[in-house]
């Protein structure tokens, strides 16, 4: 039997059963999530669940830039340091940078300081690039 790999929307890339779209528009976290949802297919701001997934995403983003942080789908909706993925994925893999998680920083970004492999918390109203993900 020939198993066909699912196709992603134009301009999105495929990795291990998921499609990813990187958007260089500036959005706050909640607007970025709404925009991801607007693309359909059950898309949300991206969950990152392994180092391999993080590395693949980082390699892709590096073809555009290596200096701007990028919103991902991790947030702290209760503002109690109880982080969760907006797409409902289990919060098991963690890759926080050493920065303080204090203050009014309840949304997570991929940090450009370590080739996008580590995350930092930031104020959710900051306008940044963002990464969407869906399972085709």
């Amino acid at each position: 039997d020939i198993i066909m790999r699912p196709s992603c929307a134009p301009g999105w890339f495929y990795h291990k059963s998921n499609c990813y779209g990187y958007f260089r528009k500036l959005r706050n976290w909640s607007d970025a999530e709404l925009e991801c949802q607007s693309y359909g297919n059950g898309a949300h701001l991206a969950s990152i669940l392994s180092l391999k997934e993080a590395s693949t995403i980082a390699e892709y983003i590096s073809g555009y830039q290596r200096s701007q942080p990028i919103w991902i789908g991790l947030h702290d909706p209760q503002k109690r340091q109880q982080w969760q993925w907006i797409d409902g994925a289990m919060y098991l893999y963690r890759s926080w940078s050493g920065k303080s998680m204090g203050g009014n920083k309840h949304c997570a970004e991929m940090s450009s300081n370590n080739n996008f492999l580590t995350w930092s918390s930031n104020e959710c109203n900051k306008r940044q690039h963002f990464l969407c993900k869906y399972r085709p």
Partner: antibody, heavy 118, light 103 residues
């Protein structure tokens, strides 16, 4: 091992178009950006643009947006750059080179020497 | 787009001499690469991410800098180091090159 194979030379008439090829082997073609670089005789390097074979996403330097079109054929692991409306200014060596964040080496093709002449 | 200016354009050095060449960016960049190219051959990545030596590059080479100012240094010049060196910023697209320093 990683290899990027390019034809050695192309001779084309002014006003015509040409499609340069870069055949990749030794790695997962769809997982790395392919970049194209121009070098005129005795001159420096110019970054033309890049393409991600896994999505077809492209970026171009503004200078080359109306000159170059980057495409890939994932079935043959080949990247292409089409150059249109050729003039003598387009005579140069064109290199393909593979991107990679965590690599202590990078990979370049041998370059295709394009000559535009009547 | 970010413009990179290399200086000097041409320089010479005697064996054993310390050599420094610079690359100035028109706006701040996060990462700088350096390439070595000898006549008739493809360029080779020489220093990447500002200060990391590519595979096979002798330890006499070093790279440093931040913001808009970067440099490549050879602690003790050897004949085989004669080449043209290009800087390239990999901070934001398009990933522009400098015009080169011929050593």
């Amino acid at each position: 091992q990683v290899q990027l194979q390019q034809p050695g030379s192309e001779l084309v008439r002014p006003g015509a178009s040409v499609k340069l090829s870069c055949k990749a082997s030794g790695y997962t073609f769809t997982s790395y950006w392919m970049h194209w670089v121009k070098q005129r005789p005795g001159q420096g390097l110019e970054w033309i643009g890049n393409i991600y074979p896994g999505s077809g996403s492209t970026n171009y330097d503004e200078k080359f947006k109306s000159k170059a079109t980057l495409t890939v054929d994932t079935s043959s692991s080949t990247a292409y750059m089409q150059l249109s409306s050729l003039t003598s200014e387009d005579s140069a060596v064109y290199y393909c080179t593979r991107g990679g964040l965590w690599l202590r080496v990078d990979y370049w093709g041998q370059g295709t020497t394009l000559t535009v002449s009547s | 787009q970010i413009v990179l200016t290399q200086s000097p354009a041409i320089m010479s050095a005697s064996p054993g001499e310390k050599v420094t060449m610079t690359c100035s960016a028109s706006s701040s960049v996060s990462y700088m690469h350096w390439y070595q190219q000898k006549s008739g051959t493809s360029p080779k990545r020489w220093i990447y991410d500002t200060s990391k030596l590519a595979s096979g590059v002798p330890a006499r080479f070093s790279g440093s800098g931040s913001g808009t100012s970067y440099s490549l240094t050879i602690s003790s010049m050897e004949a085989e180091d004669a080449a043209t060196y290009y800087c390239q910023q990999w901070s934001s697209n398009p990933f522009t090159f400098g015009s080169g320093t011929k050593l």
